[in-house]
């Protein structure tokens, strides 16, 4: 019961241009090109996009025109391969151009860089931004798409169109305001934070599809949609899962026009059938397309239906479990996951998937046993420790977060993770631990029933960042193992890691702990990052340092920064007091 149009089109590019409209077509092609060729200048991409758009228009006018019957991959790949500096800028990625489709596109996908060597985006003064916005609104917004897309090569393209729409609205409103900065800056901060979160969430979806396959993604989707739409029947959830999988497979595969088009179709279908899906969709379905799709993706869980009987009857107590499992494995396991998830909005998706995997493993074993029913009769008892483990972990960490506050909680995680995987680069450890630490303010405020889905599913997103960054430059077998063995067990795998006893401490380098007056002009966030970078380095030098030792050194460091930033001659203070601090720290840590 797929919603997507299956009819063949003579010209795929004309079909998508007509479906999406010129504005969305151009925006999506720009995103696609920027996500593939992340180092290319903005002007080069705009030129390529304009050429593709003009060609698409000729195909709209006459679908039989030359080259109009070519696939989008062929058309876009040919266009990307015309870039003159491909070899100099991208090295071996240029070899992709010697391949034929579909291998060429696969090659481009493999060269997407999660951590491109690009300068940090510096926000200009508000007046400068507003002038640029008014001078050329179209270029200003294209530049936004380009800069986000090249830094986030897996950003969910139709969602980036939604962000761009909000970005435009912020400038339209705030550049006319009396206090432009007061109006604009909070909006831009919110878009930046939401954008980073959206990028990370989509990166996990793509990793799930690419590293663990369609079945893994579909299982995730069944669990999540069953929690969100517990009144929807299994056939409806299955249909939504099939369509959602197609959408995300397309976006993760660089097929952004098809992805955006199919996402719009899916939103339309959901809204046309909301009576059989969820009572929470009404407001979403009254919004324009981009807002509607975003709203549906974020919609709150519907109320659980009344009169749900115990699952034990069908999945444990019945003597026919093995017959049902053997004759209809996917339907039976899918139904189990659906029924369990719709009853447990209080569980994380990854926990539900662990339970489903445990159930499947038990049936595989028991259905081959002499007395299958006796063997699987206690399978639900095996779930208890799996449920209690994240519950206890979240309880302990929320208590720690409430006791320490976000910054110090992040520091505790920095120490914990640096000791687990000290080989990982310091910037990655800082970035990942800071994000892990944000789970406190994001999730601990929730009541018990919402804590686990909030926390553990968020941690899955953050640990995926660690996995994709580590995959680019692998340095730790333990990280590789936790990242590749099981998608749903990544968090328990990292949680279970103890201090790496094989690690040889890093040589002490005074330069790492030398600070200058420029730290005083940094924002509070940037200053925290400097201090947290130093903390990671300390742990790498002295992995066996106690909490108390590290706390003493960090307290001294904070006092040192505060003192020197108040001094008249800041630079001299940093030079002289810095030497003393390094010496004192070495003594305190026994370096």
């Amino acid at each position: 019961r797929g919603v997507f149009r299956r009819d063949a089109h003579k010209s795929e590019v004309a079909h998508r241009f007509k479906d999406l409209g010129e504005e969305n077509f151009k925006a999506l092609v720009l995103i696609a090109f920027a996500q593939y060729l992340q180092q290319c200048p903005f002007e080069d991409h705009v030129k390529l996009v304009n050429e593709v758009t003009e060609f698409a228009k000729t195909c709209v006018a006459d679908e039989s025109a030359e080259n109009c019957d070519k696939s989008l991959h062929t058309l876009f790949g040919d266009k990307l391969c015309t870039v003159a500096t491909l070899r100099e800028t991208y090295g071996e990625m240029a070899d992709c151009c010697a391949k034929q489709e579909p291998e060429r596109n696969e090659c481009f996908l493999q060269h997407k860089d999660d951590n491109p060597n690009l300068p940090r985006l510096v926000r200009p003064e508000v007046d400068v931004m507003c002038t640029a916005f008014h001078d050329n609104e179209e270029t200003f917004l294209k530049k936004y798409l380009y800069e986000i897309a090249r830094r986030h090569p897996y950003f969910y393209a139709p969602e980036l169109l939604f962000f761009a729409k909000r970005y435009k609205a912020a400038f339209t409103e705030c550049c006319q305001a009396a206090d432009k900065a007061a109006c604009l800056l909070p909006k831009l901060d919110e878009l930046r934070d939401e954008g980073k979160a959206s990028s990370a969430k989509q990166r996990l979806k793509c990793a799930s599809l690419q590293k663990f396959g369609e079945r893994a993604f579909k299982a995730w989707a069944v669990a999540r949609l069953s929690q969100r739409f517990p009144k929807a029947e299994f056939a409806e959830v299955s249909k939504l899962v099939t369509d959602l999988t197609k959408v995300h497979t397309e976006c993760c595969h660089g097929d952004l026009l098809e992805c955006a088009d199919d996402r719009a179709d899916l939103a339309k279908y959901i809204c046309e059938n909301q009576d059989s899906i969820s009572s929470k969709l009404k407001e979403c379905c009254e919004k324009p397309l981009l807002e509607k799709s975003h709203c549906i993706a974020e919609v709150e869980n519907d109320e659980m239906p009344a009169d749900l009987p115990s699952l034990a009857a069908d999945f444990v107590e019945s003597k026919d479990v093995c017959k049902n499992y053997a004759e209809a494995k996917d339907v039976f396991l899918g139904m189990f996951l659906y029924e369990y998830a719709r009853r447990h909005p209080d569980y994380s998706v990854v926990l539900l998937l662990r339970l489903a995997k445990t159930y499947e493993t038990t049936l595989e074993k028991c259905c081959a046993a002499a007395d299958p029913h006796e063997c699987y009769a206690k399978v639900f008892d095996e779930f208890k420790p799996l449920v209690e483990e994240p519950q206890n972990l979240i309880k302990q960490n929320c208590e720690l977060f409430e006791q320490l506050g976000e910054y110090k909680f992040q520091n505790a995680l920095l120490v914990r993770y640096t000791k687990k995987v000290p080989q990982v680069s310091t910037p990655t450890l800082v970035e990942v631990s800071r994000n892990l630490g944000k789970v406190g303010s994001k999730c601990c405020k929730h009541p018990e029933a919402k804590r686990m889905p909030c926390a553990e599913d968020y941690l899955s997103v953050v640990l995926n960042q660690l996995c994709v960054l580590h995959e680019k430059t692998p340095v730790s077998d333990r990280v590789t193992k936790c990242c590749t063995e099981s998608l749903v067990n990544r968090r328990p795998c990292f949680s279970a890691l103890e201090v790496d006893e094989t690690y040889v401490p890093k040589e002490f380098n005074a330069e790492t702990f030398t600070f200058h007056a420029d730290i005083c002009t940094l924002s509070e966030k940037e200053r925290q990052i400097k201090k947290q970078t130093a903390l990671v380095e300390l742990v790498k030098h002295k992995p066996k340092a106690t909490k108390e030792q590290l706390k003493a050194v960090m307290d001294d460091f904070a006092a040192f920064v505060e003192k020197c930033c108040k001094a008249d001659d800041k630079e001299t203070c940093f030079a002289e007091e810095g030497k003393k601090l390094v010496a004192a720290s070495q003594a305190a840590l026994g370096l």
């Epitope: 299994f234 069908d314 107590e317 017959k323 049902n324 209809a328 339907v331 029924e339």
Partner: antibody, heavy 120, light 108 residues
Framework: EVQLVESGGGRVQPGGSLRLSCAAS????????MNWVRQAPGKGLEWIGH???????YYATWAKGRFTISRDNSKNTVYLQMNSLRAEDTATYYC??????????????WGQGTQVTVSS | DIQMTQSPSSLSASVGDRVTITCQAS??????LAWYQQKPGKAPKLLIY???DLTSGVPSRFSGSGSGTDFTLTISSLQPEDFATYYC??????????FGGGTKLTVL
């Protein structure tokens, strides 16, 4: 509206055959185990069998061989094929929806029933 | 197949009375028992499932208890609309199910 409507009942000669239909509306049959239950005049409820979401049919011991349950998901309809009918098969035949795809009970949704009379 | 034995087969009572109907399974069915109410010419209506869970919309004067092999349906204070036939159903032990013989509740 979520409902089940049985049809196909009527008078049939002993030894004859009849195929009953149960058309579902407002939901997808493929998501549920669909049951047939009968009730002879003045008697109690008697479960005949069901077809589950995995398309596996189960029957009461007495019904095996003469009764066959099938379904057509595209028509959103479940069928009960009855062969070698006897006078004691005279009853109202109900279609009932299981709680889930592999459930034998409880049955919250029932059809209105269709009357089958076996007599010469 | 599991046998379900329901008693009594018929029962007379008055409005306001407390009424108890029992159902016994030939082997343990844990808590997998449902109770139905049927009025003449109508399809059965689910009252209780999983032995003691009340179906939404059913008045709270109906309650169920028991597990294993012995189960009870109680109507705490009979109302005029409660005069009907009641059936128990055992389910979940396999992919088959069985109904009890029924209890006809009439006005005294």
């Amino acid at each position: 509206e979520v409902q089940l409507v049985e049809s196909g009942g009527g008078r049939v000669q002993p030894g004859g055959s009849l195929r009953l239909s149960c058309a579902a509306s407002g939901f997808s049959l493929s998501s549920y185990a669909m049951n047939w239950v009968r009730q002879a005049p003045g008697k109690g409820l008697e479960w005949i069998g069901h077809i589950n979401a995995g398309d596996i049919a189960y029957y009461a011991t007495w019904a095996k061989g003469r009764f066959t349950i099938s379904r057509d998901n595209s028509k959103n309809t479940v069928y009960l094929q009855m062969n070698s009918l006897r006078a004691e098969d005279t009853a109202t035949y109900y279609c009932a929806r299981g709680a889930g795809g592999f459930s034998t009970g409880p049955f919250k949704l029932w059809g209105q029933g269709t009357q089958v009379t076996v007599s010469s | 197949d599991i046998q379900m034995t329901q008693s009594p087969s018929s029962l007379s009572a008055s409005v306001g009375d407390r009424v108890t109907i029992t159902c016994q399974a030939s082997e343990s069915i844990n808590s997998r028992l449902a109770w139905y109410q049927q009025k003449p010419g109508k399809a059965p209506k689910l009252l209780i499932y999983d032995a003691s869970d009340l179906t939404s919309g059913v008045p709270s004067r109906f309650s169920g208890s028991g597990s294993g092999t012995d189960f009870t349906l109680t109507i705490s204070s009979l109302q005029p609309e409660d005069f009907a036939t009641y059936y128990c159903q055992g389910y979940g032990g396999s992919s088959t199910t069985t109904f009890g013989g029924g209890t006809k509740l009439t006005v005294l």
